[in-house]
């Protein structure tokens, strides 16, 4: 008789999740010599220990603490790039501008990027059928708690000028309910962070509006200013040209506004 299994509203654990995490860890430590001392089997064991045999609606930041310890890493605090709803461009940027880091450029972010995972209370099984949805089921699920934990700590680590890439094509360019709006903004440390600089990425080629005047950007400016952090904003009218100019800053076409 098949055992009754809780049906959640979200997709199940990514197939081959253990193998994927382990393989990503090995790849990351090979690419980043400063992380070659990391024992990837221990990393997987700590990751697994955070959610296996636990109710997937009752996960805490403390559950991930053993994994956090193993993911200790040097990140230049003044080279942090946050992003909201525009992950691909942010990652393309840091692949070119190698001295800047998104969360997914760190070991822990790299391990979990685009993956889903959850377990079941009192069994050692991974649930490949379904996992809790943040809205429909519960917010304290393994994936949401992981990203809230690492996002908070990433923001806390930031200093000097922090950059954030925002999607100018969205109805809410700044969304208070995004990870950036609900976690990272509120965990920037005013004694360490001087300025938050927003880069608003335009979608349409003929879009010449000043999206820095958007009401949601003004809302972000207000939140940041109240936290005693300065705010600045730049329109990136041509993201394709922006990336090209990061690659080739000497190009004559890169002196004009992008």
């Amino acid at each position: 008789v098949p055992r009754w299994r809780q049906q959640w509203s979200g997709p199940g654990t990514t197939k081959r999740f253990p193998e994927t995490v382990l393989a990503r860890c090995v790849k990351y430590t090979e690419i980043h010599p400063e992380m070659r001392h990391v024992d990837c089997q221990s990393v997987w064991d700590a990751f697994k220990g955070a959610f296996i045999s636990k109710h997937p609606c009752n996960i805490t930041e403390e559950d991930y603490q053993p994994l956090m310890k193993l993911g200790t890493q040097t990140v230049p605090c003044n080279k942090i790039l946050l992003w909201s709803r525009i992950k691909d461009l942010a990652h393309q940027f840091t692949q070119v501008q190698r001295d800047m880091f998104t969360l997914e450029d760190t070991l822990l972010g790299y391990l979990a990027d685009d993956l889903t995972w959850c377990g079941e209370f009192n069994t050692s099984k991974i649930n490949y059928q379904s996992c809790p949805d943040w809205r429909k089921d519960c917010s304290n699920n393994p994936v949401s708690v992981f990203w809230k934990t690492v996002s908070r700590r990433f923001a806390e680590a930031a200093c000097d000028v922090v950059h954030v890439m925002l999607n100018g094509s969205r109805s809410k360019i700044f969304d208070k309910n995004s990870t950036f709006g609900s976690v990272e903004v509120h965990n920037l440390q005013p004694e360490k962070v001087q300025t938050l600089e927003a880069w608003v990425i335009h979608g349409g080629r003929e879009d010449s509006r000043d999206l820095c005047q958007d009401p949601t950007i003004k809302e972000l400016e207000s939140i940041i200013s109240k936290r005693n952090i300065q705010f600045s904003c730049k329109n990136i009218y041509r993201p394709d040209k922006f990336l090209q100019c990061v690659k080739n800053p000497e190009d004559s076409s890169c002196t004009s506004e992008i």
Epitope: M68, K69, T72, Q73, V75, N78, V150, R153, A157, E191
Partner: nanobody, 117 residues
Amino acid sequence: EVQVLESGGGLVQPGGSLRLSCAASGFTFSSYAMSWVRQAPGKGLEWVSGISNSGGSTDYADSVKGRFTISRDNSKNTLYLQMDSLRAEDTAVYYCADGTGPFFDYRGQGTLVTVSS
């Protein structure tokens, strides 16, 4: 600007003890959790121990649990690490850093601890 100055390192025999200090300035020390991290020669960064802003909560890497003790004196803006029963594998440069990690950017020069007979 966050500034820290670590001291107290040196050469010690296996089984010996050292007490590291970290003088912090440029930020409200009592508002921040703090950590000790270390880097052994040719190795990556390893988190050693952390302490809450009030000092009421502490945590340790498995490799140092029962041998190292982290503490702080908020009135002196100073973080401490008492290191007992030292082993050769504890040889490293020790840094103090604000926050609990896992992301660190050390602001000090660190203090070298060498455990050797």
